[in-house]
Interface confidence: low
Amino acid sequence: SAPFSFLSNVKYNFMRIIKYEFILNDALNQSIIRANDQYLTAAALHNLDEAVKFDMGAYKSSKDDAKITVILRISKTQLYVTAQDEDQPVLLKEMPEIPKTITGSETNLLFFWETHGTKNYFTSVAHPNLFIATKQDYWVCLAGGPPSITDFQILENQA
């Protein structure tokens, strides 16, 4: 699915980091882990030290959107979660610093963060119908829903 063109003129300004060093577990209690330099995957871990720790940065939209817009960075790195297309793996993009302003095609770095009870959803700003998802026998990717798993639990203070 192509990015929504009407979003291209919306500007997102970085505010602050709102969460540090949290773990994402999917509905099967699988944690997101590093697969390699580029991709993430999910695995059932006995030792959460293996799980990726994320930082979450908040952005404010120029159109005063009610949704919370965030960027996801692997803690203690300069790697940022970047959306591709539907059913494609999310990539880890290296950037020297957290972007101060994001607009246009760079919105593939941003996600709308929604919470429903203990369930957390991350919708791609570039592809508003697609979520960060885990999928059996695959990488962490963008998906519209089942059979991919789109809801996550945030585990904090795991240090």
């Epitope: 590093r34 697969a35 390699n36 991709y39 995957t41 695995a43 059932a44 871990l45 030792n47 026998d137």
Partner: antibody, heavy 122, light 107 residues
């Protein structure tokens, strides 16, 4: 040096079971995902199954799903393949092979055993 | 599942020849492709991983290229010990799969 030694092959009748073992040495077994790959006589390579470094994630080819079970004992450095409901087409040399350290991902297989022959025959 | 198709299935060549083997994936696999060499009665040997990276100890006459769904293994100058069967393998999906193999024979 890295060594993988398969055992447990033999002749078995269709419908029966067989358990293959692969004993690892020369590396920290518990850090690596490991795989079974088979090769029917005169045919190409067919990936069969894989298990993650800690045994928590298992993956199977469609052709063996529900019949074969991969497992590992990290305390003894052994990989297993339990083969049930064997069919004539399961006749092959079975190799164990090592993937990459500490991740549950597909990987090129840099180290292989010498293989063990399983013959399913009535 | 991802299907891997190799061509040709066999090739006859002489020592010193340049040999090219192709591998096509049924869907895009980025650069997640490995090449193996297998001699009769022996286990496969990893030659190239991630499409173009030469495994340690493999002679530089072997090279790999390609990305997406089309890949190539090239032997720049065939040596007597290179007569063998070559397999590609995708390492993109958790369910690994191999190509059908290409037998390099003496002309």
């Amino acid at each position: 040096q890295v060594q993988l030694v398969e055992s447990g092959g033999g002749v078995v009748q269709p419908g029966r079971s067989l358990r293959l073992s692969c004993t690892a040495s020369g590396f920290t077994f518990s850090m690596f995902g490991v795989h079974w790959v088979r090769q029917a006589p005169g045919k190409g390579l067919e990936w069969v199954a894989a298990v993650s470094y800690d045994g928590s994630n298992k993956y199977y080819a469609e052709s063996v799903k529900g019949r074969f079970t991969i497992s590992r004992d990290n305390s003894k450095n052994i990989l297993f393949l339990q083969m049930d409901s064997l069919r004539l087409e399961d006749t092959a040399v079975y190799y164990c092979a090592r993937g990459r350290p500490k991740v549950v991902i597909p990987a090129p297989l840099a180290h292989w055993g010498q293989g063990t022959l399983v013959t399913v025959s009535s | 599942d991802i299907q891997m198709t190799q061509s040709p299935s066999s090739v006859s060549a002489s020592v010193g020849d340049r040999v090219t083997i192709t591998c096509r994936a049924s869907q895009g696999i980025s650069s997640w492709l490995a090449w193996y060499q297998q001699k009769p009665g022996k286990a496969p040997k990893l030659l190239i991983y991630e499409a173009s990276n030469l495994e340690t100890g493999v002679p530089s006459r072997f090279s790999g290229s390609g990305s997406g769904s089309d890949f190539t293994l090239t032997i720049s100058s065939l040596q007597p010990e290179d007569f063998a069967t070559y397999y590609c393998q995708q390492t993109s999906s958790f369910l690994l799969s191999f190509g059908g193999g290409t037998k390099v024979e003496i002309k």
